[in-house]
């Protein structure tokens, strides 16, 4: 007997062909011999089966001796053997209907688990293989699990169900809720305005939740909440903000924070958390601020950086268009009795300048000027 696989909620067409290429009488029945549909002349007639309102045929094919049974909005319990009676002969088709669903929501937080559950008819023994958007293959039986979802797992998962050497393909769209970057670092000269941006890696029609930015200043012994905010339908409203520093926040996505000026006491690391409505867990993004200051006090020219810098970063002091006078993997460098001219303080990583501050050293009889 012929085997046809169907997908829950989909439409399937079971074929039945007569040797005569003309419209003749036919009937479709299920395994309990209950009539599903047939014809009476040109009319489609339906029997008392549970498929009544979901069964159909394709009238234009009857004249060609084809009498299909079309079942719409398939259910798992439609799995059965269907019998077509035409010209004193019987054609049997076994229909197996499968369903594949995600455990809860298809919108999951980064780090959470995805479970796909296969619904299958009694007596079937299907195997399932799923391919993630980044090409990772997972295999299983009735359930498949993927732990620790990553941003690259967002997209269409393609799952193939195999039964009786036949296959049916499911596509499930998964959205991993996360920030575009897990961590970012901002380098600023003292006194400059600081912009922090927290773009999301997903788009949804309505986004509601609440968030907070905790800040651990390098100079402070404990962390402190700098700002708390609400998010309602992609509109941002500030709930509470510290007086020092007085952060400003954009009213629209992406989440955007402005620190009026970079000061050494603000240098450090922050953690922005976002709790989304109807989701357990939170989204996190780390943000780091490195502040540079160049000063001349009497006969000492000093360059300092505050904040989380990696040990491989190089801090240098050099006179413009000259070789570096001092270059160290430290957070402060200085030059005694600097000669007059425009000095540059550079923070660099493998030759790439991350931060630069200029200071003009005047001849010894005058005071320094900071441009």
């Amino acid at each position: 007997k012929k085997v046809v696989l169907g997908k829950k909620g989909d439409t399937v067409e079971l074929t039945c062909t007569a040797s005569q290429k003309k419209s003749i009488q036919f009937h479709w029945k299920n395994s309990n011999q209950i009539k599903i549909l047939g014809n009476q002349g040109s009319f489609l007639t339906k029997g008392p089966s549970k498929l009544n309102d979901r069964a159909d045929s394709r009238r234009s094919l009857w004249d060609q001796g084809n009498f299909p049974l079309i079942i719409k909005n398939l259910k798992i319990e439609d799995s059965d053997t269907y019998i077509c009676e035409v010209e004193d002969q019987k054609e049997e088709v076994q229909l197996l209907v499968f369903g594949l669903t995600a455990n809860s929501d298809t919108h999951l937080l980064q780090g959470q688990s995805l479970t796909l559950t296969l619904e299958s008819p009694p007596g079937s023994s299907p195997s399932v293989q799923c391919r993630s958007p980044r090409g990772k293959n997972i295999q299983g039986g009735k359930t498949l699990s993927v732990s620790q979802l990553e941003l690259q797992d967002s997209g269409t998962w393609t799952c193939t169900v195999l039964q009786n050497q036949k296959k049916v393909e499911f596509k499930i769209d998964i959205v991993v809720l996360a920030f575009q970057k897990a961590s970012s670092i901002v380098y600023k000269k003292e006194g400059e305005q600081v912009e922090f941006s927290f773009p999301l890696a997903f788009t949804v029609e309505k986004l509601t939740g609440s968030g907070e930015l905790w800040w651990q200043a390098e100079r402070a012994s404990s962390s402190k909440s700098w700002i708390t905010f609400d998010l309602k339908n992609k509109e941002v409203s500030v709930k509470r903000v510290t007086q020092d520093p007085k952060l400003q926040m954009g009213k629209k996505l992406p989440l955007h924070l402005t620190l009026p000026q970079a000061l050494p006491q603000y240098a450090g690391s922050g953690n922005l958390t976002l709790a989304l409505e109807a989701k357990t867990g939170k989204l996190h993004q780390e943000v780091n601020l490195v502040v540079m200051r160049a000063t001349q006090l009497q006969k000492n020219l000093t360059c300092e950086v505050w904040g989380p810098t990696s040990p491989k970063l190089m801090l240098s002091l050099k006179l413009e268009n000259k070789e570096a006078k001092v270059s160290k993997r430290e957070k402060a460098v200085w030059v005694l009795n600097p000669e007059a001219g425009m000095w540059q303080c550079l923070l660099s990583d493998s030759g790439q300048v991350l931060l630069e501050s200029n200071i003009k050293v005047l001849p010894t009889w005058s005071t320094p000027v900071q441009p």
């Epitope: 439409t11 399937v12 040109s42 045929s57 394709r58 234009s60 004249d63 719409k72 393909e169």
Partner: antibody, heavy 117, light 107 residues
Amino acid sequence: QVQLVQSGAEVKKPGSSVKVSCKASGYTFTNYYIHWVRQAPGQGLEWMGWMNPNSGNTGYAQKFQGRVTITADESTSTAYMELSSLRSEDTAVYYCARDWPNWFDPWGQGTLVTVSS
Amino acid sequence: DIQMTQSPSSLSASVGDRVTITCRASQDISNWLAWYQQKPGKAPKLLIYDASSLQSGVPSRFSGSGSGTDFTLTISSLQPEDFATYYCQQAISFPLTFGGGTKVEIK
């Protein structure tokens, strides 16, 4: 949701061929027939033919037999209608439509094909 | 081929009017008939199938009746968005054929 998106407008010379595409989304492509219907400017609807993407079977209106070919690419869920030996009276909007057993629902947005020398 | 003839080819009506369009088949097509609505520059939209079944999402002011060779589409109370061209279509045999259309215009 179920959607059919067709290729853009074409201008063709008499005697040449045109191939219009129809990309399906939001449903299992192989489970539904695709039909092609055309509409000349200011005129009514004219059925051209059908295809079952699952079996590859096709059927064409007698009027277009030999000039029309309907094909499908399952991997991209796209149906194609190629009309050859074009003449000026083939200037029309060509629609693809999903078969909703016996009926057409939904339809593509239409593709204007202009045949002019 | 089965010929489908619609009448009238055009009609003028006002908002709130009851409008009736007829479609006649050249041979018995039992109830294998559908009605479509088409607005200028847009694709047709299925309104009624199996002669009298209302397609999901279509307002209940649209109704279809008839069997055999004579069919009717009725709009019980014409709304501004109903001004369009209406087509009938038979599905009893290939080639599938449409009526010539009925244009419903504002009086």
